[in-house]
């Protein structure tokens, strides 16, 4: 018999453990400021209600939509008005407007301190005393910091987190075991968050078509033995899954993702030869494994692309007959043949091909007009190839920190209006592309670098949208998803920028700098570099090198001094004076 109750349906499909985890994530992503204990109470109430509906679907309110049930529950939070201000106004609205309102109030930069692993003994005691609460707290802390985190993937990372503590809390040296493992997991979580934020932005700002095109290219590279119909099916399912998660429909999203994994594993033969190992795993690991699976080998008998897309006399007829299918087929065929290209580049090529057909199919002699279309791809391919070559050479010469600083200078000159914390965060992440991609073989560099840059630049776009200060950023972020990176790359220094007034307070440092972890020390130095550039945007590389060298020496000297605070107070103003003289 058909299920009347949506919440009972999801509770039964997902099981209690996953249901509770997903509800906790959903509430934490919407009400990011609420304490953990408040969320636990809401989750408990929601789960009890769902359990009741699973037992009797005709129960009161069991037939209500999930948005109605979730929204009603969120709106019972007592401190909503004081803690969230405008968010409380959402509760005056009816569904679906109420949920849309909640979504617009998600804060991409809530300003919580970074998640760190404190004393291992304390952590292990907490883990062993109450495992459920410990893991729930982890889910909550990640979800509130990353309001668009891909919820089913967060359940997977929580399982990994549990595994780390299960293993390391038995170890003789808990810290030695925990530190590298939690750090590696933290990195994965941050990358995962940024990737999903990019997917959500693609869907929300550029629509289904943009997301589907991105997915066609990616999946065609991964599964070159699958035919276009198979790729289309996977893309349609994947779009539904991510639309649901990005829209806060986490139960539906996780359920559909599980269905998709089931479909892939039941149809391995027509998708890829690399899936068997993944498909033998339990659900969470299976879905994660499928998402990360290595790409299949290319079929040996691929015909030249030109036959169907240039030389065929019926190109225009085929294009006009079913434009999106024809362009989709082009993107699929091109992508499966070019695993070494970035998805962004493949989409630019498809865009160029589409523009050429639009123009040529309206002429008297289309074949002679579009006959050289593949030649027009050359500069589009060479641009990211050169960019990767030049920047990897720079990275190899300077190392990660030096490369970050070079990018910091580059981007501060391009976008001096952008806030210092944003410039530092984004440039540090852009600089990591070196470590992440430049060490890879030539054939993997471009796809690694450019697709990673797309994700990082999306972070800039998302942060800038919250408080827009630069028309240049707005333009690059909103004009074209696939051309964002080339748009930012093409920017020269901003000649309209009026330098910032000098403020000695910005360059005043204290002894607390000495006790900071290395990464945070770097952030402080890099923030000073940005402020310096905002004050003197015309500073040369040599001048900056001198000033930053002096600054490093000053920090080292004072941190080694007996009276650190005294040293900072005495030497700081001298450093500022010397820097001003050097940049005069």
């Amino acid at each position: 018999e058909a299920q009347q109750s949506e919440i009972a349906h999801r509770y039964n499909d997902l099981g209690e453990e996953h249901f509770k985890g997903l509800v906790l994530v959903a509430f934490s992503q919407y009400l990011q400021q609420c304490p953990f204990e408040d969320h636990v109470k809401l989750v408990k109430e929601m789960t009890e209600f769902a359990k009741g509906c699973a037992a009797d679907q005709s129960g009161a309110d069991c037939g209500k939509s999930l948005h109605t049930l979730f929204g009603d529950k969120l709106c019972t939070v007592a401190s909503l008005r004081e803690k969230y201000g405008e968010l409380a106004d959402c509760c005056e609205k009816q569904e679906p407007e109420r949920n849309e309102c909640f979504l617009t109030h998600k804060d991409d930069n809530p300003g919580f301190p970074p998640l760190v692993t404190p004393d291992p003994e304390v952590m292990c005691t907490a883990f062993q005393e109450n495992e459920q609460q410990f893991l729930g707290k982890y889910l909550y802390e990640v979800a509130r910091r990353h309001p668009y985190f891909y919820a089913p993937e967060l359940l997977y990372y929580t399982q990994q987190y549990k595994g780390v503590f299960t293993e390391c809390c038995q170890a003789a040296d808990k810290a030695a075991c925990l530190t590298p493992k939690t750090e590696a997991l933290r990195e994965k979580v941050l990358v995962s968050s940024a990737r999903e934020r990019f997917k959500c932005a693609s869907l929300q700002k550029f629509g289904d078509r943009a997301f589907k095109a991105w997915s066609v290219a990616r999946l065609s590279q991964k599964f070159p033995k699958a035919d276009f119909a198979e790729v289309s099916k996977l893309v349609t399912d994947l779009t539904k899954v991510h639309k649901e998660c990005c829209h806060g429909d986490l139960l539906e999203c996780a359920d559909d993702r599980a269905d998709m994994a089931k479909y892939i594993c039941e149809n391995q033969d027509s998708i890829s030869t690399k899936l068997k190992e993944c498909c033998d795993k339990p659900l969470l690991e299976k879905s994660q494994c499928l998402a990360e699976v290595e790409r299949d080998e290319l079929p040996g008998d691929l015909t030249p692309l030109a036959a169907d897309f240039v030389e065929d006399k019926e190109v225009c007829k085929n294009y006009q007959e079913a434009k999106d299918v024809f362009l989709g087929t082009f993107l699929y065929e091109y992508s499966r043949r070019h695993p070494e290209y970035s998805v962004s580049l493949l989409l630019r090529l498809a865009k160029e091909y589409e523009a050429t057909l639009e123009k040529c199919c309206a002429t008297a002699d289309p074949p002679s007009c579009y006959g050289k279309v593949f030649d027009e791809f050359k500069p589009l391919v060479e641009e990211p190839q050169n960019l990767v070559k030049v920047n990897c050479e720079l990275f190899e010469k300077l190392g990660e920190y030096g490369f970050q600083n070079a990018l910091l200078v580059r981007y501060t000159k391009k976008l001096p209006q952008v806030s210092t914390p944003t410039l530092v965060e984004v440039s540090r992440k852009l600089g990591k592309v070196g470590t992440k991609c430049c060490t890879k073989p030539e054939t993997e560099r471009m796809s690694c670098a450019e697709d990673y840059l797309a994700v990082v630049l999306n972070r800039l776009c998302v942060l800038h949208e919250k408080t827009p200060v630069s028309d240049r950023v707005t333009k690059c972020c909103s004009e074209s998803l696939v051309n964002r990176r080339p748009c930012f790359s093409a920017l020269a220094g901003d000649e309209t920028y009026v330098p910032k007034e000098f403020n000695a307070e910005t360059f005043t440092f204290h002894a607390d700098l000495c006790t900071l972890p290395d990464a945070e020390k770097q952030v402080k130095k890099q923030s000073a570099l940005v402020e310096l550039l905002k004050h003197k945007p015309k500073a040369t590389e040599e001048q900056l090198k001198t000033v930053m060298g002096d600054f490093g020496a000053f920090v080292d000297k004072c941190c080694a001094a007996e009276n650190k605070e005294g040293c900072f107070a005495e030497e700081g103003p001298k450093l500022v004076a010397a820097a001003q003289a050097a940049l005069a």
């Epitope: 035919d227 119909a229 289309s232 099916k233 149809n267 027509s270 079929p299 169907d308 019926e314 024809f326």
Partner: nanobody, 118 residues
Framework: EVQLLESGGGLVQPGGSLRLSCTAS????????MGWVRQAPGKGLEWVSW????????YYADSVKGRFTISRDNSKNTLYLQMNSLRAEDTAVYYC???????????WGQGTLVTVSS
Amino acid sequence: EVQLLESGGGLVQPGGSLRLSCTASGFTFRHYRMGWVRQAPGKGLEWVSWIRPDGTFTYYADSVKGRFTISRDNSKNTLYLQMNSLRAEDTAVYYCAKSYMAGTFDYWGQGTLVTVSS
């Protein structure tokens, strides 16, 4: 416009053979997955078999595996279904279908009736 024209159906005794053909027009045949769908009297539609655009991979419903063979000739825009060892339960209207996405079809023909009876 898209047209799919089936032929080759008829009355055949159990254990006998038939070869169905489907001629396609109005679309780029070699770009699409094609298949055969059937509807037995009083039943719903079921996928019998499908074949990739390049012919390199085929799928068969469990009920016809080892008895039916799907093939295509892209130069002739034609799809075939060779049916051997026919059984009474294979009696149905067989439709040629164009598939733009796995598991679905957007066009199918008028159908050709296959009756297996002694």
